[in-house]
Interface confidence: low
């Protein structure tokens, strides 16, 4: 069954997906699609990478991590209720039926009416450590749950602008990645 991720209307949603390239710059094509992963490819593609670059994306869908190091986590900007649903991250490993497919369920909740001094995410995991991430906008305090033995799609929700930070390395070091080669 799909792992569930939550965001509020107006926030950025983050759907994690990682792999480890076999060698620096030796990238594997990845596609993100709206809807569960079909047998081949992605349905309703919202973003696609090739062996070198992000070669297709649609408005509001971004890779804010370093995809050249295998961080292909999807950020959806300014979500609405219509963004709810299943998303497919497909790591297109060469060879017959070698693809790694991950279905992630995004649940969008109406925005909270009570104003808070700091914008907060809805985290489903405990958050033993706090950190500040660097993003395009003002710094925000974010939280990260402890990382037990988990598979690729069970990573706790991270900051909406993960990028190339210590946190990204923590995640990769946790083993929550697919290794290619």
């Amino acid at each position: 069954s799909e792992v569930e991720y939550r965001a509020e209307v107006g926030q950025n949603a983050y759907l994690p997906c990682f792999y480890t390239p076999a060698a620096p710059g030796n990238l594997v094509p990845v596609c993100w699609g709206k809807g569960a992963c079909p047998v081949f490819e992605c349905g309703n593609v919202v973003l696609r990478t090739d062996e070198r670059d992000v070669n297709y994306w649609t408005s509001r869908y971004w890779l804010n991590g370093d995809f050249r190091k295998g961080d292909v986590s999807l950020t959806i900007e300014n979500v609405t209720l219509a963004d709810s649903g299943i998303y497919c991250c497909r790591i297109q490993i060469p060879g017959i039926m070698n693809d790694e497919k991950f279905n992630l369920k995004l649940v969008i909740k109406p925005a909270k009416v009570t104003p808070a001094p700091t914008r907060q995410r809805d985290f489903t995991a405990a958050f033993p450590r706090m950190l500040t991430t660097r993003g395009h906008g003002p710094a925000e305090t974010q939280t990260l749950g402890s990382l037990p033995d988990i598979n690729l799609t069970q990573i706790s929700t991270l900051a909406n602008e993960l990028r190339d930070s210590r946190l990204a390395n923590d995640l990769r070091d946790s083993g929550a990645t697919i290794r290619i080669g």
Epitope: P24, V54, W62, H136, S165
Partner: antibody, heavy 121, light 107 residues
Framework: EVQLVESGGGLVQPGGSLRLSCAAS????????IHWVRQAPGKGLEWVAG????????EYADSVKDRFTISADTSKNTAYLQMNSLRAEDTAVYYC??????????????WGQGTLVTVSS | DIQMTQSPSSLSASVGDRVTITCRAS??????VAWYQQKPGKAPKLLIY???FLYSGVPSRFSGSRSGTDFTLTISSLQPEDFATYYC?????????FGQGTKVEIK
């Protein structure tokens, strides 16, 4: 072939204005980040400003904030740097450059040939 | 702002020499460092990104490494076309900042 071509440089008096253009070909600027980086004569490189054209997000170096404005016209595949209240210390070759890894802060894989801005009375 | 202190500011070397240029960041920048080569009158060219990734088309004699906040560009065997000025750049946070440059001259 990816190309960036700057234009609009020249001699201007202190306090004057110039508008630099960066015409891109071989790629769509709305899929990348565009930056302006300058180099004073005989000096090193200094980042000036950056824009994400599709989102209109902009950032500026403190030294040019409130004087320079970066913008982009995706229909013309061109980025611009409007420079107002120019000072002698703004004299430099201005390069536009493309952000490499698909986000604002990263290395620059393609650069234009540069356009010289001279601020002098 | 993060300062990138590059050394040496210039060096003389011969063809075939191994050349090392270092850059020290004033605070943690993770692996977010790039290296560029610039020749007189020309725009910089990207050599290395994310500290150690060789940019497409760059000869393999160029390599980059990181140790904490120290970053190194190595040219394993200097070629005639490598005589130029080299710059490091941190792209970890705003504003991105460059080192002051290292001029590699013919001995």
């Amino acid at each position: 072939e990816v190309q960036l071509v700057e234009s609009g440089g020249g001699l201007v008096q202190p306090g004057g204005s110039l508008r630099l253009s960066c015409a891109a070909s071989g790629f769509n600027i709305d899929r990348y980040y565009i930056h302006w980086v300058r180099q004073a004569p005989g000096k090193g490189l200094e980042w000036v400003a950056g824009i994400t054209p599709v989102r209109g997000y902009t950032e500026y170096a403190d030294s040019v904030k409130d004087r320079f404005t970066i913008s982009a016209d995706t229909s013309k595949n061109t980025a611009y740097l409007q420079m107002n209240s120019l000072r002698a210390e703004d004299t430099a070759v201005y390069y536009c450059a493309r952000g490499y890894v698909y986000r604002m802060w990263d290395s620059y894989d393609y650069w234009g040939q540069g356009t010289l801005v001279t601020v002098s009375s | 702002d993060i300062q990138m202190t590059q050394s040496p500011s210039s060096l003389s070397a011969s063809v075939g020499d191994r050349v090392t240029i270092t850059c020290r960041a004033s605070q943690d920048v993770n692996t977010a460092v790039a290296w560029y080569q610039q020749k007189p009158g020309k725009a910089p060219k990207l050599l290395i990104y994310s500290a150690s990734f060789l940019y497409s088309g760059v000869p393999s004699r160029f390599s980059g490494s990181r140790s904490g906040t120290d970053f190194t560009l190595t040219i394993s065997s200097l070629q005639p076309e490598d005589f130029a000025t080299y710059y490091c750049q941190q792209h970890y946070t705003t504003p991105p900042t460059f080192g002051q440059g290292t001029k590699v001259e013919i001995k």
